[in-house]
């Protein structure tokens, strides 16, 4: 279970077509 203080920070993963981009790369989202 995530600690409360971590909830405002993004989690970053590799994906394609994410983060408003057409290619593959790292994408960080809260």
């Amino acid at each position: 279970r995530r600690r409360r203080r971590d909830t405002h920070f993004p989690i970053c993963i590799f994906c394609c077509g994410c983060c408003h981009r057409s290619k593959c790369g790292m994408c960080c989202k809260t």
């Epitope: 993004p10 970053c12 590799f14 593959c24 790369g25 790292m26 960080c28 989202k29």
Partner: antibody, heavy 121, light 107 residues
Amino acid sequence: QVQLVESGGGVVQPGRSLRLSCAASGFTFSNYGMHWVRQAPGKGLEWVAVIWYVGSNKYYADSVKGRFTISRDNSKNTLYLQMNSLRAEDTAVYYCARAQEGMAPDAFDIWGQGTMVTVSS
Amino acid sequence: CYELTQPPSVSVSPGQTASITCSGDKMGERYASWYQQKPGQSPILVIYQDTKRPSGIPERFSGSNSGNTATLTISGTQAMDEADYYCQAWYSSTNVVFGGGTKLTVL
């Protein structure tokens, strides 16, 4: 100015441990992912590990997985690399590098000066 | 295991254009970054997201990426551009790949 300063390198015997540190200044450390990248003498760059904003969001290269641990202390603006079960092939200059800011941090935009780790008996 | 292949060396005359290639499986489907490293120094980011230049990097540095090849182009090459150049791309969350590096010699 924005700066990363590594420390903790040295000569260590195979199988032993070493902890590297990277002191950050000139930017809000907690707002950036941080990497370790190494370079064996006369060789190219090799990515080692990354730790993103949340301490649990971290990834390792297969070559170091299970032996190295990346961590950060945002209150001290410091990045760490705990290296256990060291091997001769771990001999390299170790750089800490900052991930780009933003939603899509593909590149390494700031690099430290590096610290040399030599694994030898 | 993914690999990015660069030519070991490229030579160029001052004022001419240097092109350094970086080839890998479906390279054009991911974002390429390029780094410059001079002897005894740390790497410097010169191109990211295929074509973008960080602030402070001269306009003579440009990049492209399509198919299986990313290319770093240095127009009007200067003596100060002599260095090793590395491409880099992500292939998964746990797989950041650097090319083997290209030594650029300005004749």
